[in-house]
Amino acid sequence: ELCDDDPPEIPHATFKAMAYKEGTMLNCECKRGFRRIKSGSLYMLCTGNSSHSSWDNQCQCTSSATRNTTKQVTPQPEEQKERKTTEMQSPMQPVDQASLPGHCREPPPWENEATERIYHFVVGQMVYYQCVQGYRALHRGPAESVCKMTHGKTRWTQPQLICTGEMETSQFPGEEKPQASPEGRPESETSCLVTTTDFQIQTEMAATMETSIFTTEYQ
């Protein structure tokens, strides 16, 4: 089941999935002046069996000026540098994602890829948040969000992270005004069925990753 929305936006923070659940789709998008080749894949799909997961399909872009010829150019470092995405791009993977069954690692870039990636997440996906440069984190709980199914609808849990400017005087975590959950009531009051595939295993994994997830910043 695809998640209806993108993960929540936190001011001055970005998020990243450390691994992508089977069923996740990634748009095959091309940068300006390029387009997907006519016979090429529309999206990449994380698929697999009990022992191995990988991305099906390859994205290919061609110059908009030419018809259906792929220009095999290795992207220059500065070309890759410009990619921005809601999910943080990291040139090094801080954990061995193959150790998490039913998940794919970050797909490598393709020639003339768009500067942004749009993923279509599935129920059970977890993403991790970090404050952007120049802001520091005030944690009230886990800086992560999970796509859950409740009442037959998908929603993302609210990450317990506030990013404050280094120079700003702000409240300490204990002094925060409580934020309402998306439905306007605490999650614990929700009595209907909650589907959170792999939540436990990912939470445990997150605990071991906490110090290493964001050590490499994409400059």
């Epitope: 748009n27 998008e29 091309c30 529309l42 279509h120």
Partner: nanobody, 123 residues
Framework: QVQLVESGGGLVQTGDSLRLSCAAS????????LAWYRQAPGKEREFLAA???????LYADSVEGRFTISRDNPKNTVHLQMDSLKPEDTAVYYC?????????????????WGQGTQVTVSS
Amino acid sequence: QVQLVESGGGLVQTGDSLRLSCAASGRSFRNYILAWYRQAPGKEREFLAAISWLDGTLYADSVEGRFTISRDNPKNTVHLQMDSLKPEDTAVYYCAADRGPVRPVLAPDVDYWGQGTQVTVSS
């Protein structure tokens, strides 16, 4: 509540052009494709074109080269520029929004529909 409202339909002559618009509201459409379909009398609803948030496009063979889909994200609108129209293009044209990447979604599986706008091409 998601709403898709089409406009721009009408009666034109063979060879003329027409530009349809669709205003989408009620949610963020970042991870949705916006698409156009049409339904001629007595026929099934037919996929025409789709576009992603980042302007990745897909066209049905029947309209590629004649129709152009475009998207204005800040305004949450999608347009369909139709050139060199033919009498067989006569149909009700529907705007659609669907979760996921650009792909020719079968009509029964589409998440949201507009109410449609009539396009008639006379010879």
